[in-house]
């Protein structure tokens, strides 16, 4: 069986810079320190046993040669433990081991931070056979190092199902500071303090931060990253950035604009999408929001009639979808309409006023004081009424529609008459004797037919009756009147 031995390592700080066994490659050629030098590698922690110094596994083979001499323990030779280099530079490092020739098919694999490196990496393994042993040198090269190449690299070799692991080679890629948090654009309330954050990392550390506002440095001396700037308030737009400095140089963050919230600009392009007798659908294009979201809008409606009392109707609505149906308007009327919108700061001015008109509508009330009486001499029913109030005609009267229903012995017949707008009386022929005639009248405009009046009933007797009184629209509260003669 193969046993495992572990060398103890002398701890050296891994950071910030060179130490025995580390290598700054910017100016120094790569060194391979021989095992005999007495060099002890840096303190590295085994991924499987955190906290324990680890310098690789040593396989002690139990196989003996013909002369029964035990073979020397197999271990990777010590090499450089720490390489420090700048971003975009090239680096090459290697592992070497001497393996007795009795072992066949030995392969070396490279691992970084516990994961095997496969595929498109520049790893080359060279074999130098001798009489009894073969020297194997595994080289790993990176042509242009990036921060992501930082880490701990090891070689592994499998022999007889046992693993031999090299000491780690720690690669530290240094470069300009790299931002992990940059200031963000904001919209702020005037004269109100707010915070901006900037964070950058190396290596090398430390990273120091300067804040810049409108091209002027805010802090005379740098602050260690991360840094929070409390801006005491602004009265006008400002541009902020932060500078991150380390020993390699300076990186400047993106510049961010901090805007001051203000009342919105007035809406523009208020337009009429649709008009009916009692409503107008309007739309508008919102003005600039003042760097603060719109909350709601107010539609102001004034009668354009110079004789009107000038009162303003106000309708509140949500800011979206920039559409509103104004209801409860009079038909055939002219209105001035303006729109104003608000954000958290306040209301915009009112948009330019536009003129809009409602269309004709069907009358909203029925003719009044409908009276009905029988004229036996001419065998007619005379009907009289009063036209609805002008305000409620909702347009120009073009006439009236008269509905008369004749009911007798289970038979019912409805007839409709149209009457010109000038009259306020009509005469209809008696259709059926010994029957009830029910009359209703509606006013008519181009906008349509209005509501019918309450029904007025009159009884039409058989021939020979003499005395007839008129029937009329009942007083409110009396439903369905019938005149019995």
């Amino acid at each position: 069986a193969i046993t495992e031995a572990r060398e103890e390592a002398k701890p050296y700080p891994l950071f910030p810079g060179p130490f025995p066994g580390s290598l700054q490659t910017d100016h120094t050629p790569l060194l391979s320190l021989p095992h005999a030098s007495g060099y002890q590698p840096a303190l590295m922690f085994s991924p499987t046993q955190p906290g324990r110094p680890h310098t690789g596994n040593v396989a002690i083979p139990q196989v003996t040669s013909v002369e029964s001499k035990p073979l020397p323990p197999l271990a990777f030779k010590h090499t450089v433990g720490h390489i420090i280099l700048s971003e975009h530079k090239g680096v090459k490092f290697n592992c070497s081991i001497s393996v007795p020739n009795i072992y066949q098919d030995t392969t070396i694999s490279w691992w970084k931070d516990g994961k095997e490196l496969l595929g498109a990496h520049h790893a080359i393994t060279q074999f130098y056979p001798d009489d009894e042993v073969t020297a194997i040198i595994a080289s790993f090269s990176i042509t242009s190092v990036q921060r992501s190449d930082n880490g701990s690299y090891i070689c592994k070799m499998k022999i007889n199902n046992e693993e031999i692991v090299s000491d780690p080679i720690y690669i530290e890629v240094q470069g300009l500071p790299h931002f992990t948090k940059q200031p963000e654009s904001m919209n702020v309330t005037r004269n109100t303090a707010f915070n901006l954050t900037c964070q950058a990392v190396g290596p090398p550390e430390p990273v120091n931060i300067f804040w810049v506002q409108n091209s002027s440095r805010v802090n005379e001396q740098p602050e260690k990253s991360p840094s929070v700037l409390t801006v005491p308030g602004l009265t006008e737009m400002a541009v902020f950035s932060c500078e991150a400095h380390n020993d390699k140089g300076l990186t400047v963050s993106k510049g961010v604009q901090i805007n001051i919230k203000a009342i919105p600009s007035p809406p523009t392009e208020v337009s009429i999408r649709n008009s009916t007798a009692h409503s107008i659908l309007i739309s508008w294009v919102p003005g600039f929001d003042g760097y603060s979201p719109f909350r709601n809008c107010s539609i102001q409606v004034k009668e354009a009639d110079p004789l009107s009392n000038g009162s303003v109707m106000i309708f509140n609505t949500s800011a979206l979808p920039h559409l509103y149906q104004i209801k409860q308007l009079q038909a055939l009327a002219n209105y001035s309409i303006g729109v104003s919108c608000m954000n958290e700061i306040g209301w915009s001015a009112v948009s330019p006023w536009i003129l809009a008109s409602t269309t004709e509508g069907a009358p909203s009330v029925a003719p009044l004081n409908v009276t009905v009486f029988l004229n036996e001499s001419s065998d007619n029913v005379d009907i009289r009424w009063m036209k609805p109030p002008t305000k409620q005609q909702d347009g120009e009267l073009v006439g009236y529609r008269i509905s008369h229903v004749w009911q007798s012995a289970g038979i019912s017949k409805e007839l409709l008459e149209e009457v010109g707008q000038n009259g306020s009386r009509a005469r209809i022929s008696v259709q059926v004797h010994n029957a009830t005639c029910t009359v209703r009248i509606a006013a008519v405009t181009r906008g349509g037919v209005g509501p019918f009046s309450d029904p007025v009933k009159i009884f039409i007797p058989a021939h020979g009756w003499v005395d007839y009184a008129p029937s009329s629209t009942p007083a409110p509260g009396n439903a369905d009147p019938v005149l019995i003669i």
């Epitope: 004269n191 804040w211 506002q213 409108n214 002027s216 805010v218 802090n219 005379e220 001396q221 740098p222 602050e223 700037l229 409390t230 005491p232 308030g233 009265t235 400002a238």
Partner: antibody, heavy 118, light 106 residues
């Protein structure tokens, strides 16, 4: 609490040198710049410049280049103002002031009166 | 360099009066600081970054302004307010102070 304590008054002759000190306490000295402000008798405040307490690099206002020197003794949290080849017009009270964001001088020394007279 | 002009140079007021002093800059600046100085004393920080009262400053003081025009207002002057008030700009190097406004109480 934060304090800036300046050295006492000085009476000097023209051509001599004076070095006044400003000892800071109550905060990390090397985190904030130290500014120097001149006030001649009955006159306005004049910003002379500042010294970076971390790097030791001084910055002088245009009217204070040449004969004026800012320096530090970081281990003692002390900043110094030295004026060489003193002139009568150097007679003034000199204040040190702790720098902050937006060049806000939230803490001032009590002032050192330097009198230059033959 | 930016020149700060304070007016008036001397301001005389009775207790309870409202007073305003102004500081105009030769170019636009981001913030104006104000300091109060009484004879024989070092300046005291008074108003930070245009409108923020320093610790211990009474609420009757206020600051405002932007661009090239800034002001310090005392809503009801008290005897203890007698002092010289200096403005100092932030926004351009070198740092500069105004010539001061001396407030006298009648």
């Amino acid at each position: 609490q934060i304090q800036l304590v300046q050295s006492g008054p000085e009476l000097k002759k023209p051509g001599e040198t004076v070095k006044i000190s400003c000892k800071a306490s109550g905060y990390t000295f090397t985190n904030y710049g130290m500014n120097w402000v001149k006030q001649a008798p009955g006159k306005d405040l004049q910003w002379m410049g500042w010294i970076n307490t971390y790097t030791g690099e001084p910055t002088y206002a245009d009217d204070f280049t040449g004969r004026f020197a800012f320096s530090l003794e970081t281990s003692a949290s002390t900043a110094y103002l030295q004026i060489n080849n003193l002139k009568n017009e150097d007679t003034a009270t000199y204040f040190c002031a702790k720098g902050g964001h937006y060049a806000w001088f939230a803490y001032w020394g009590q002032g050192t009166l330097v009198t230059v007279s033959a | 360099q930016i020149v700060l002009s304070q007016s008036p140079a001397i301001l005389s007021a009775s207790p309870g009066e409202k007073v305003t002093m102004t500081c105009r800059s030769s170019s636009s600046v981001s913030y104006m600081h104000w300091y109060q100085q009484k004879p024989g004393s070092s300046p005291k920080p008074w108003i930070y970054a245009t409108s923020n009262l320093a610790s211990g400053v009474p609420g009757r003081f206020s600051g405002s302004g932007s661009g090239t025009s800034y002001s310090l207002t005392i809503s009801r002057v008290e005897a203890e307010d007698a002092a010289t008030y200096y403005c100092q700009q932030w926004g351009s190097n070198p740092r500069t102070f105004g010539g001061g406004t001396k407030l006298e109480i009648k």
